[in-house]
Interface confidence: medium
């Protein structure tokens, strides 16, 4: 018979024959032959594989480093990775939760809408027209542009969401 060019689901093609993939939680030891099945072995204590696979090495479970403020939210199994979270009152810096911050800062151009609490992170909002923030801060709101008129000055440089207006003296018409 013709050697296969494609295999069924949960199989892979090798040496012109279809071998079974290893199930999640197991790694490949040896490919199947005409006479033997694929040989698989369970992953070790701190390892996992989460798909049907032909990997010869299992992946290491993620380490929740307490020096980065991390702790284990869900212990890994042979089929799943460990899930990390931050210590109480702290917040993940990304969806993958690779490190923690006490509370996020709002970048220049953004102000704090709500200061962080033990359970919620800082909420930032863009500074609207007429307001600015020139600092990265976990506390400061957007500040209103300086009103040059109230100081009997004129706007020399327009403000942005990151900078205040620059005021200057009015041009006096010479007689």
């Amino acid at each position: 018979p013709e050697p296969p060019t494609a295999c069924r689901e949960k199989q892979y093609l090798i040496n012109s024959q279809c071998c079974s993939l290893c199930q999640p939680g197991q790694k490949l030891v040896s490919d199947c032959t005409e006479f033997t099945e694929t040989e698989c072995l369970p992953c070790g204590e701190s390892e996992f594989l989460d798909t049907w696979n032909r990997e010869t090495h299992c992946h290491q479970h993620k380490y929740c480093d307490p020096n980065l403020g991390l702790r284990v939210q869900q212990k890994g199994t042979s089929e799943t990775d460990t899930i990390c979270t931050c210590e109480e009152g702290w917040h993940c810096t990304s969806e993958a939760c690779e490190s923690c911050v006490l509370h996020r800062s709002c970048s220049p151009g953004f102000g704090v809408k709500q200061i962080a609490t033990g359970v919620s992170d800082t909420i930032c909002e863009p500074c609207p027209v007429g307001f600015f923030s020139n600092v990265s801060s976990a506390f400061e709101k957007c500040h209103p542009w300086t009103s040059c008129e109230t100081k009997d000055l004129v706007v020399q440089q327009a403000g942005t969401n990151k900078t205040d207006v620059v005021c200057g003296p009015q041009d006096r018409l010479r007689a």
Epitope: S99, V101, H103, R104
Partner: nanobody
Framework: EVQLLETGGGLVQPGGSLRLSCAAS????????MQWVRRAPGKGLEWVSA????????YYADSVKGRFTISRDNSKNTLYLQMDSLRAEDTAVYYC?????????WGRGTLVTVTS
């Protein structure tokens, strides 16, 4: 490399005072908000206080408001925490932290013990 060194901790009686210092190096100190954070024995971390880069704006946790005062001297790259009317529940290791409080920008901490 960012380095933060806290000093000034010690043993004090309830109602007493202590002044903590944090010497900073490895970054432009005045550009950053700085924080004090503490960890009581067997408890999680608790944010205590923060101060803006220019030192004009200060922020406090409700548990220390009116008793603690945060300040900074940008010419000396140093952060301070004046702690008055100390209580037993203020016993903790106190850390200063740069800006966001990323764990990798922390000092080793200084232990404050309030006991009679």
């Amino acid at each position: 490399e960012v380095q933060l060194l806290e000093t000034g901790g010690g043993l004090v009686q309830p109602g007493g005072s202590l002044r903590l210092s944090c010497a900073a190096s490895g970054f432009t100190f005045e550009w950053y908000e700085m924080q004090w954070v503490r960890r009581a024995p067997g408890k999680g971390l608790e944010w205590v206080s923060a101060i803006s880069g220019d030192g004009y704006r200060t922020y406090y946790a409700d548990s220390v408001k009116g008793r603690f005062t945060i300040s900074r001297d940008n010419s000396k790259n140093t952060l301070y925490l004046q702690m008055d009317s100390l209580r037993a529940e203020d016993t903790a290791v106190y850390y200063c932290a740069k800006e966001l409080g990323y764990f990798d920008y922390w000092g080793r901490g200084t232990l404050v013990t309030v006991t009679s």
